[in-house]
Amino acid sequence: GWVWNQFFVPEEMNTTSHHIGQLRSDLDNGNNSFQYKLLGAGAGSTFIIDERTGDIYAIQKLDREERSLYILRAQVIDIATGRAVEPESEFVIKVSDINDNEPKFLDEPYEAIVPEMSPEGTLVIQVTASDADDPSSGNNARLLYSLLQGQPYFSVEPTTGVIRISSKMDRELQDEYWVIIQAKDMIGQPGALSGTTSVLIKLSDVNDNKPIFKESLYRLTVSESAPTGTSIGTIMAYDNDIGENAEMDYSIEEDDSQTFDIITNHETQEGIVILKKKVDFEHQNHYGIRAKVKNHHVPEQLMKYHTEASTTFIKIQVEDVDEP
């Protein structure tokens, strides 16, 4: 019968040829009376057999990632008779893996959005690298993820590639971060290959800023001839948040005379001071009122940022008009 062990050949051998093993018939007494032949895909081009000894050699560099298995056939012939000594037999040559492929991030570019002020441990995104080497061959395709850029705000789970928040971030200070993740094979041991990817992490706004008046005092004038409903001036607050988190409502906090009102222009986010009752210079020539401003939408969990509304003082001078 045929005698052989399992055949393995390392990929990417840089030698001219590589001895893989020996195929022989147990009837072969070593006197060169038998001739061994190799058949099948790769015979003669990738593998050769020493026809006298049955020794098999790889005669070209192999790439496991291109082809990991070769199925060949062997024949052994008695030179004197030309007859087969053994039935033709099929055998397998497996290409064994070396760590010749670096991890690659296939889903680039990565981009994630996470709310500002998210607590430590909040999941941002998972990045995944793949390695073309054999996952069953040692640690050639076992990856470890690490953070090259992004501390102290982010961390990455070494085995999963899950990026989490490790420190609270304020969008109003910085609204986006570039995080660089490295994937290293061989679980980081010597001889490891690595790949990197960049993740753009954008912070979405939360309502963590209350509106604040630009001025602590506004001076306005109103003609005593102005009808009710007249807009006598505008006041303005600023809010570091954006979008609906910066929408605000102005209101009167103090107006003993109940002469004025404030309405909000939601397009410009300005407060418009309106005359609610007609004024008479001869009766009262100036007024002092206090206005306050608050955000339109404040979720319950963010109320801590909005405890005291910003206020401003408005001095209104009444202008005299000659009366007939």
Epitope: N14, S45, I49, D50, Y57, I59, Q60
Partner: antibody
Framework: QVQLLESGGGLVQPGGSLRLSCAAS????????MNWVRQAPGKGLEWVST????????YYAESVKGRFTISRDNSKSTLYLQMNSLRAEDTAVYHC??????????????WGQGTLVTVSS | EIVMTQSPVTLSLSLGERATLSCRAS??????LAWFQQKPGQAPRLLIY???TRATGIPARFSGSGSGTEFTLTISSLEPEDFAVYYC?????????FGGGTKVEIK
């Protein structure tokens, strides 16, 4: 017995081309790798190129890469070397040599007498 | 590439003397080394392959030894036809490379 007979050498101007042939007999040509080795006048041996038995694998010395092409016609048991962009330093006797068996597949167990290539203006 | 260094460049010996030729590889080439003999106006002839296996028809007075980086060709007793140039060659890595040769001449 194994015989190798080279032909095609001669005088050629720099930048010119030549095609060398090596006719083989006495062995199963397609089962063996074949080589070209050259020897400049009064100098040592220099490997030029190798081709595997089926012709799938070819290898070249850095000095000839991109200029020389090795090929074979197994039906005619003939090995070829197409030499382009020839230079004065390519002047040499060109030998073809048969590969061996097994671990000596890319060896040189039988040599032809050689053909002289002279590159000169 | 692997650099093959042969020594000595010339060896002057008398008939019947023992000749020892050395060949050193710049890095390990296992046992993938061949020795060739070349006489003036002739093609090289294979003497030894696999560092120590004699080629067909080569007399027993020629023997090879060594592995890795250090190799030796020994001619136990020089015959008149042995005076020639001897080359070592590695076939473990591409490009295949030859040593510069050792000339064995009659003293």
């Amino acid at each position: 017995q194994v015989q190798l007979l080279e032909s095609g050498g001669g005088l050629v101007q720099p930048g010119g081309s030549l095609r060398l042939s090596c006719a083989a007999s006495g062995f199963t040509f397609s089962s063996y790798a074949m080589n070209w080795v050259r020897q400049a006048p009064g100098k040592g041996l220099e490997w030029v190129s190798t081709i595997s038995g089926g012709g799938a694998n070819t290898y070249y010395a850095e000095s000839v890469k991109g200029r020389f092409t090795i090929s074979r016609d197994n039906s005619k048991s003939t090995l070829y070397l197409q030499m382009n962009s020839l230079r004065a330093e390519d002047t040499a006797v060109y030998h073809c040599a048969k590969g061996g068996m097994g671990g000596y597949y890319y060896g040189m167990d039988v040599w032809g007498q050689g053909t002289l290539v002279t590159v000169s203006s | 590439e692997i650099v093959m260094t042969q020594s000595p460049v010339t060896l002057s010996l008398s008939l019947g003397e023992r000749a020892t030729l050395s060949c050193r590889a710049s890095q390990s080439i296992s046992s993938n080394l061949a020795w060739f003999q070349q006489k003036p106006g002739q093609a090289p002839r294979l003497l030894i392959y696999g560092a120590f296996t004699r080629a067909t028809g080569i007399p027993a007075r020629f023997s090879g030894s060594g592995s890795g980086t250090e190799f030796t060709l020994t001619i136990s007793s020089l015959e008149p036809e042995d005076f020639a140039v001897y080359y070592c060659q590695q076939y473990n890595y591409w490009p295949l490379t030859f040593g510069g040769g050792t000339k064995v001449e009659i003293k």
